[in-house]
Amino acid sequence: EEELQVIQPDKSISVAAGESATLHCTVTSLIPVGPIQWFRGAGPGRELIYNQKEGHFPRVTTVSDLTKRNNMDFSIRISNITPADAGTYYCVKFRKGSPDHVEFKSGAGTELSVRAKPSAPVVSGPAARATPQHTVSFTCESHGFSPRDITLKWFKNGNELSDFQTNVDPAGDSVSYSIHSTAKVVLTREDVHSQVICEVAHVTLQGDPLRGTANLSETIRVPPTLEVTQQPVRAENQVNVTCQVRKFYPQRLQLTWLENGNVSRTETASTLTENKDGTYNWMSWLLVNVSAHRDDVKLTCQVEHDGQPAVSKSHDLKVSAHPKEQGSNTAPGPALASAAPLGGSG
């Protein structure tokens, strides 16, 4: 009679975490008499997974009825698989012995790999805002996946980025893995509405990658441009000077008017106008009573944007070009329309 063979038909199987794994094993003969045991691993350190004769194995069930006299199917099902269950499983036939059963023949083994989905990628940007033309770093992290093979891509507004570095940890064997990637992005003035996307593709995701996003609005600071202009005269002795604060982001902005270096008024930006690119404009005006000034007036619009050092723009009002008539009760002449002298030798 042909000697008993232990047949494990599956060289390897892959199971999703949380599912059940079926490990197939059949024998070709009922002789010799003796139990079947399942082990994970080989040699003296192997781990007993199931013993036909004794022990308590709550996660293991047999596929067929082992009490039947002619049963030759010793397949088992392991429930609620976790990444820690990965390994090589052996179906081993023992023959009756005294006092102990003697290992008789082993199957070739079935390698169980466990598929676990990566967590949703989390994208984080720099702690401090940066201005256009600067390069900033974004990180993307995803955890808990198995097997180790994974693909990560970066996009900015749908355009794939190439300047990034990715690591999968640990370098050695593990029940599950993590990925960490750092991408470098050059900011432009138009990036307030831009998004950076980290995309992770893994065998467990069936071609539907996971994405994590970061809005560049959280990262960018677009400094304002200032323009100070003199408006037409509102009254005979008043000049309206406006400070146009354009194309800034974020909204946080404080403006101070200085007359000859002395603070005239401070205000916080409100009722802003939003541009298509997400930046803001704001305008502040100052009424200057020319008759109150004997000398030229230097008007400065000073803007502190988002906690940064103040930027300023100045405008000169030349009062001396229009000397007032002493003792006259008549209203003074028209206010200066510009900083340049109005004809004459000045």
Partner: antibody, heavy 122, light 112 residues
């Protein structure tokens, strides 16, 4: 191709603890036993113990009370710690890989590190 | 523990000639599965040991076929059919039937 590299101090004071690490490169820790074997100057080989991929350890009874072998699969490393060393522990220490197959058991220590010399002296 | 005894202690050889090393164990290394749990290793001068023969008679990968292992139970032999200069070094037998794994004392092979 799998390679093993031992690392650790070359000099240990008597009564102190010897600590060595073996880094496995070019292969997996899974499905193998990982041994420490030593060779005193001019003498033969002595098996100290090994650890399986599941963390189960086996030690030489002559050293058991002093030796601990541990495994860090995530770093592809395994380590040896031996307490209360004396001059008799001066040796070249080798880390090695032991193959194992179900139905057979252990079948050959097929990969060895180049060895690291440890001197116990004050 | 299983005690392994090797002989001779030293073996002067002539290149091109055969050589034989004996290894005896204090108990049988033949298990009920039919395998003999004995390995042979060569340690060349200044190098780490390398596996030559495993499970009594199986040549390891890359080992020249001039090396052969035989024996069962307690008596084992390593044969080199035609010694070459690169074969010098210390040969060790090791039992892998049970822990602790134990080595023979070694046989030093040198060119005459």
């Amino acid at each position: 191709q799998v390679q093993l590299q031992e690392s650790g101090p070359g000099l240990v004071r008597p009564s102190e603890t010897l600590s060595l690490t073996c880094t496995v490169s070019g292969g997996s820790i899974r499905n193998y036993y990982w041994s420490w074997i030593r060779q005193p100057p001019g003498k033969g080989l002595e098996w100290m113990g090994f650890i399986y991929d599941n963390g189960r350890t086996f030690y030489n009874p002559s050293l058991k009370s002093r030796v601990t072998i541990s495994l860090d699969m995530s770093m592809n490393q395994f380590s040896l710690k031996m307490t209360s060393v004396t001059a008799a522990d001066t040796a070249v220490y080798y880390c090695a890989r032991v193959r194992a197959y179900s139905g057979i058991g252990l079948d050959g220590t097929d990969v060895w590190g180049q060895g690291t010399t440890v001197t116990v002296s004050s | 523990d299983i005690v392994m005894t090797q002989s001779p202690l030293s073996l002067p050889v002539t290149p091109g000639e055969p050589a034989s090393i004996s290894c005896k164990s204090s108990q049988s290394l033949l298990y009920s599965n039919g395998y003999a749990y004995l390995d042979w290793y060569l340690q060349r001068p200044g190098q780490s040991p390398q596996l030559l023969i495993y499970l009594g008679s199986n040549r390891a990968s890359g080992v020249p076929d001039r090396f052969s292992g035989s024996g069962s139970g307690t008596d084992f032999t390593l044969k080199i059919s035609r010694v070459e200069a690169e074969d010098v070094g210390v040969y060790y037998c090791m039992q892998a039937l049970q822990t602790p794994l134990t080595f023979g004392g070694g046989t030093k092979v040198e060119i005459k």
